[in-house]
Interface confidence: medium
């Protein structure tokens, strides 16, 4: 009965989500005045009401003494799982931002507008993605964004949307929309850094006592502008970069080092000039080749220069001179590489010299060439082995999952809560990888059936024996390793799986190195050994997100061979089993805990 009640609640909430009523959303008006002269970005934060952030959206329905039986939105402390919509002006249904607007990017609970323009004006709505209670449905924020180009050119020295801070010195960050006002007449400003409130900063200019590299980031400044009718939040975004001081040195040439070069007549030749330029805020490097022939001197038109390495302190730039074939005349010439910055210039000349003992060299080169070709072919085979295997499986292999009496292709284990600061603040959370990307790619695109405890079984936590049972019913175990994982209670799931895999040859384990972690001393010996021998796939942040990335290819390589044509029916079969499982869990277990019990 209790189970049916839960399913009913879930369905009701689900229905209300599809066409949810936005009249209950809190409203915020924002103004973005952009400069037509410069590129600038803009952000919207999902400022859900304060109680929502502590998972308590329906505060107006309860007195402080009343405690609801079911706390809403238990999903996430950092509000990383929010959904954004745009409300079309013609009254059409809400549009999911991700599907319709390529110039708008969602990162956790922030919406980034990459390009300015009046067409960005409109109403944007955000709300929690994970609806855990029907009360939550009304928990949303509507942001009315008005975008205008800057009209008055009265302020000539308005602060840029890209500002530099010199490392090791004092610096300041100015709010572009207020930089023409004196500190005295400036309104109270609210500042954010990388989406986090800087509660101390209240003026239109932040003075940085001493600049460190961690001062780099995206700063947002807000202030309120009121007229007789309403008040607007005027927002500007500043990209702050930490830099070193301008170089005091002229560039140095790293290559060529020698002033003579042995060549073969009649053969093509490329001479490379690599130069290192120190950092300059206004950077106008010059790198060119010219030829000296007796008294004559002329510049050669050569391919464009390209940057081959760029660091905070310097940049290495390369430019090549290409000779289609070396002639006798070229042996009498000097090839000069000339490099220059604002401090000065440096040159390096190269004289060509004919090579001796060419026949011997041909034999040697032939042998080396063959060897290199064999090695390259081997390397290519090794590099693309996964793709080859996947291609073979697609057309040749039979479905390994038939008749193995297993319900899931994979059980996915990850850290369900974070006690450690996130390693990946600028990228995606492990929870997002497990609950969103895995189903998107492995289930929807490749037809695998996954078991995610938070989604499929019991979001509040399950008994240890339940987890063991689920792992037994899975063909693979996928474990997302991170500091939170190895130091948290979820490590028990890996321990259990390792023990089971020793007895069950059909259960294979896959480790995902989500981010760097140190093995705690307390890890059981068996788990430590498993971390060294089990196949590991490394998560490379945003690079791994696209379904065609190498990450997903490796994942598919380790997953069971599956006949994807039949996946719709297979999913229906699995879904019905999960529902049976849910029913069992809900009725059999009473005191749920957020950790596995009795282990």
């Amino acid at each position: 009965m209790l189970c049916l009640g839960w399913i009913f609640l879930w369905l009701v909430a689900g229905e209300r989500i599809k066409g949810f009523n936005i009249s209950g959303c809190s409203t915020k008006k924002l103004l973005w005045t952009y400069s037509t002269r410069s590129e600038e970005e803009f952000v919207l934060f999902c400022d859900l009401p304060e109680p929502q952030k502590s998972h308590f959206c329906h505060r107006n329905r309860l007195s402080p003494k009343q405690v609801p039986e079911h706390l809403p939105f238990m999903g996430s402390n950092d509000l990383s799982d929010v959904q954004w919509y745009q409300q079309p002006s013609n009254g059409d249904p809400l549009e999911d931002i991700r599907k319709s607007y390529p110039h708008i990017i969602q990162d956790k609970c922030t919406l980034h507008f990459l390009t300015p323009g009046v067409n960005n004006s409109g109403s944007y709505i955000c709300r929690p993605k994970m609806i855990k209670s029907p009360y939550d449905v009304a928990c949303c924020v509507k942001m009315i964004l008005e975008v205008k180009p800057q009209t008055n050119a009265s302020c000539e020295y308005s602060a840029s949307h890209k500002q530099d801070l010199l490392l090791g010195s004092t610096g300041s960050i100015s709010c572009p929309s207020l930089s023409c006002q004196s500190d005295a007449q400036s309104p109270a400003v609210t500042w954010y850094k990388n989406g986090k409130l800087l509660s101390v900063e209240r003026s239109n200019r932040i003075v940085v006592d001493e600049v460190y590299d961690y001062h780099q980031g995206t700063y947002v400044c807000d202030y309120t502008q009121s007229d007789t009718v309403s008040s607007w939040t005027v927002r500007a975004v500043v990209q702050v970069r930490t830099i070193v001081g301008d170089t005091k040195l002229k560039p140095d040439i790293l290559d060529p080092v020698e002033d003579t070069l042995e060549v073969e007549l009649g053969k093509p030749l490329t001479i490379s000039c690599k130069a290192r330029f120190g950092f300059e805020r206004v950077f106008n490097p010059v790198i060119k080749w010219y030829i000296k022939d007796s008294d004559l001197e002329w510049e050669v038109s050569v391919p464009e220069a390209k940057s081959i390495k760029s660091t905070l302190k310097d940049e290495i730039i390369e430019r090549n001179i290409i000779l289609e074939k070396v002639t006798q005349r070229d042996l009498r010439r000097k090839f000069v590489c000339f490099v220059q910055n604002s401090i000065g210039n440096t040159t390096q000349s190269v004289q060509l010299k004919e090579k001796r003992g060419v026949v011997l060299l041909y034999i040697l080169l032939g042998t080396i060439g063959t060897l290199v070709a064999v090695l390259a072919a081997s390397a290519l085979l090794y590099r693309h082995w996964i793709e080859i295997v996947l291609l073979y499986r697609t057309y040749q292999s039979k479905d390994q999952t038939l008749g193995d009496k297993k319900d899931f292709d994979a059980f996915v284990s990850y850290a369900k809560w974070s006690s450690f600061p996130s390693e990946a603040t600028s990228s995606l959370s492990e929870e997002h990888l497990a609950l969103s990307l895995f189903p998107d790619v492995l289930e929807n695109k490749y037809g695998y059936s996954l078991c995610l405890l938070e989604r499929d079984v019991a979001p509040g936590g399950v008994y240890a024996e339940d987890i063991v049972s689920i792992i037994k019913r899975s063909r693979r175990g996928i474990f997302i390793l991170s500091p939170n994982y190895v130091n948290g209670p979820s490590i028990f799931e890996l321990q259990a799986a390792v023990n089971l895999a020793l007895d069950d040859q059909t259960l294979k384990l896959i480790l995902i190195k989500f981010c760097y972690f140190q093995e705690p001393e307390s890890l059981p010996h068996l788990v430590k050994k498993a971390l060294r021998v089990l196949p590991t796939v490394t998560w490379r942040g945003l690079k791994s997100v696209p379904p065609n990335s190498r990450f997903w290819a490796k994942m598919r390589y380790h997953m069971p061979v599956k006949n994807s044509q039949g996946f719709t029916w297979n999913q229906l079969r699995i879904t019905s089993r999960i529902f049976q499982w849910k029913g069992l869990s809900r009725t059999e277990t009473t005191g749920r805990s957020s950790q596995p019990k009795e282990w």
């Epitope: 004092t170 800087l198 003075v207």
Partner: antibody, heavy 121, light 111 residues
Framework: QEQLEESGGGLVKPGASLTFTCRAS?????????MCWVRQAPGKGLEWIAC????????TYYASWAKGRFTISKTSSTSVTLQMTSLTAADTATYFC?????????????WGPGTLVTVSS | DVVMTQTPASVSEPVGGTVSLKCQAS??????LNWYQQKPGQPPKLLIY???TLASGVSSRFKGSRSGTEYTLTISDLECADAATYYC?????????????FGGGTEVVVK
């Protein structure tokens, strides 16, 4: 060896003013530290008063309750002072001078032994 | 201003035991939280910074952790020398260093 030493404490009458000095040895302020004052009433907890950045900006930061009556300043490359006015019995406490690490971690890793002030008529 | 609330005010535990001290922040302060140990007649001593990083020279018996706005200092294998008052301190998330508030302290008595 890096050390801090406070001076200037003693017995004072209500309404009086007082200046504490914190002297650093084993390091100089050129590295860009924050020097701060924290007090502790007898048998009570710690209470942050103020900080000064001893690098170029000389920025000062005060606890909201300390603004106006307390003034922190750098007097040399190795000393910082805290001036207090209109003293009351509630200001009776041990006053500690503390230094932060000089990096992004934000914590006091060096403390002085403290100087006791008793405000009584 | 952020308010730091420490619980319990006092705790007593035998030698070799484990004690957990709690510190609750009135608002989100991320991991900007430090723990100090103070013995009578001495200045405080830094134990943990950034909510969970051990300061240099501090025993690994001290462990800091965080869950939302609640921070915990756990002392395992208690020794007589651990008898002291422990304070948590937060620093506001600003561009510059601004220490903000100390908790009221928890007295640890080792029996």
């Amino acid at each position: 060896q890096e050390q801090l030493e406070e001076s200037g404490g003693g017995l004072v009458k209500p309404g009086a003013s007082l200046t504490f000095t914190c002297r650093a040895s084993g390091f100089s302020f050129s590295s860009g530290y924050y020097m701060c004052w924290v007090r502790q009433a007898p048998g009570k907890g710690l209470e942050w008063i103020a900080c000064i950045y001893v690098g170029i900006t000389g920025s000062t930061y005060y606890a909201s309750w300390a603004k106006g009556r307390f003034t922190i300043s750098k007097t040399s490359s190795t000393s910082v002072t805290l001036q207090m006015t209109s003293l009351t019995a509630a200001d009776t406490a041990t006053y500690f001078c503390a230094r932060d690490t000089g990096n992004s971690n934000y914590q006091f890793n060096l403390w002085g032994p403290g100087t006791l002030v008793t405000v009584s008529s | 201003d952020v308010v730091m609330t420490q619980t319990p005010a006092s705790v007593s535990e035998p030698v070799g035991g484990t004690v957990s001290l709690k510190c609750q922040a009135s608002e989100s302060i991320d991991s900007y939280l430090n723990w100090y140990q103070q013995k009578p007649g001495q200045p405080p001593k830094l134990l943990i910074y950034g909510a969970s990083t051990l300061a240099s020279g501090v025993s690994s018996r001290f462990k800091g952790s965080r869950s939302g706005t609640e921070y915990t200092l756990t002392i395992s294998d208690l020794e007589c020398a651990d008898a002291a008052t422990y304070y948590c301190q937060c620093t506001v998330y600003g561009v510059n260093f601004v220490p903000n508030a100390f908790g009221g302290g928890t007295e640890v008595v080792v029996k």
